[in-house]
Interface confidence: low
Amino acid sequence: FERTRSLQDPCSNCPAGTFCDNNRNQICSPCPPNSFSSAGGQRTCDICRQCKGVFRTRKECSSTSNAECDCTPGFHCLGAGCSMCEQDCKQGQELTKKGCKDCCFGTFNDQKRGICRPWTNCSLDGKSVLVNGTKERDVVCGPSPADLSPGASSVTPPAPAREPGHSPQ
């Protein structure tokens, strides 16, 4: 790498992948192994992120860009740039500090992550319950009795029965 010749800031000519080395009379030196600089003119290279343990490498670090991590199977990313991995749960569960817990009666979660959400209240839209909700699925709302043509029989399903061994918390 050539010595930089900028009159204003001798470091401004150092390209990405290098740093302006004060210990070497401000020569542009390549980033050491396991470090990178994504922009020019940097006085140091940043340490590459290491995807270890519950993290795994999605993209290797290069001299100009940081490594990118995702999570090992059974975990999912949280936070900007997958800054943390959170344990997956089954559908019908949510993650608490004490591990995966079943959704309370009247709530559901159709994903392996996130929290249990209340079933849709069909009556708020003037509709009736067409298909009962479960821990894994929301209720399906059907047309309101008023929407049915005259003479058509409106069959309202029974109120959802509590699942065996699953009591509200």
């Epitope: 940043d46 340490i47 343990g53 959170e86």
Partner: antibody
Framework: QVQLQQPGAELVRPGASVKLSCKAS????????INWVKQRPGQGLEWIGN????????NYNQKFKDRAKLTVDKSSSTAYMQLSSPTSEDSAVYYC????????????????WGQGTSVTVSS | DIQMTQSPASLSASVGETVTITCRAS??????LAWYQQKQGKSPQLLVY???TLAEGVPSRFSGSGSGTEYSLKINSLQPEDFGSYHC?????????FGGGTKLEIK
Amino acid sequence: QVQLQQPGAELVRPGASVKLSCKASGYTFTSYWINWVKQRPGQGLEWIGNIFPSDSYTNYNQKFKDRAKLTVDKSSSTAYMQLSSPTSEDSAVYYCTRFGSSGYPDYYTMEYWGQGTSVTVSS
Amino acid sequence: DIQMTQSPASLSASVGETVTITCRASGNIDNYLAWYQQKQGKSPQLLVYNAKTLAEGVPSRFSGSGSGTEYSLKINSLQPEDFGSYHCQQYWTIPYTFGGGTKLEIK
């Protein structure tokens, strides 16, 4: 609850090797990294290395790589650190530690610590 | 290796005072920093991780802050049980490294 049990003290002759033990209980031993940390009297902490019991994969601090050997016995849920050719500089308390709950952001912080083994190197 | 420089090495304070301990990393550690408390003759205990998250059971008078290379631990309204040594640790990269420690004594 998670426990890491270490003997209280070991007396070792200079040049003779010493093998320190750390018996884990209260969790699945093979699922969490075990670290070893050195603390000389009145001084700071130094990370020696760690081992993943499931496959015995190890990482070492280069400073200790030649003289520390980390192993595990899965059948007894015990981690070991063997220190070869000890000198007076190795007289210290040695802690075994366990990383935090996998899947949470504290994964690489040392959430659980043994009581430490005080090693005295003396003739 | 990432060097961790902790200051001050020791300080004296009175119960009820507020103190701040700082830790400087030789490179960007992106908040991968933990603080530990150690009482005389005891093992260290985790206080703070991810630079600012309090470990379970840690009183709210403790707080962590910082980013990049500069981090600090603040203890508001010191209690008698807070006296002892404090250590910072980076877990951004292997080898994991600790600061030199800060001994907090009663004035």
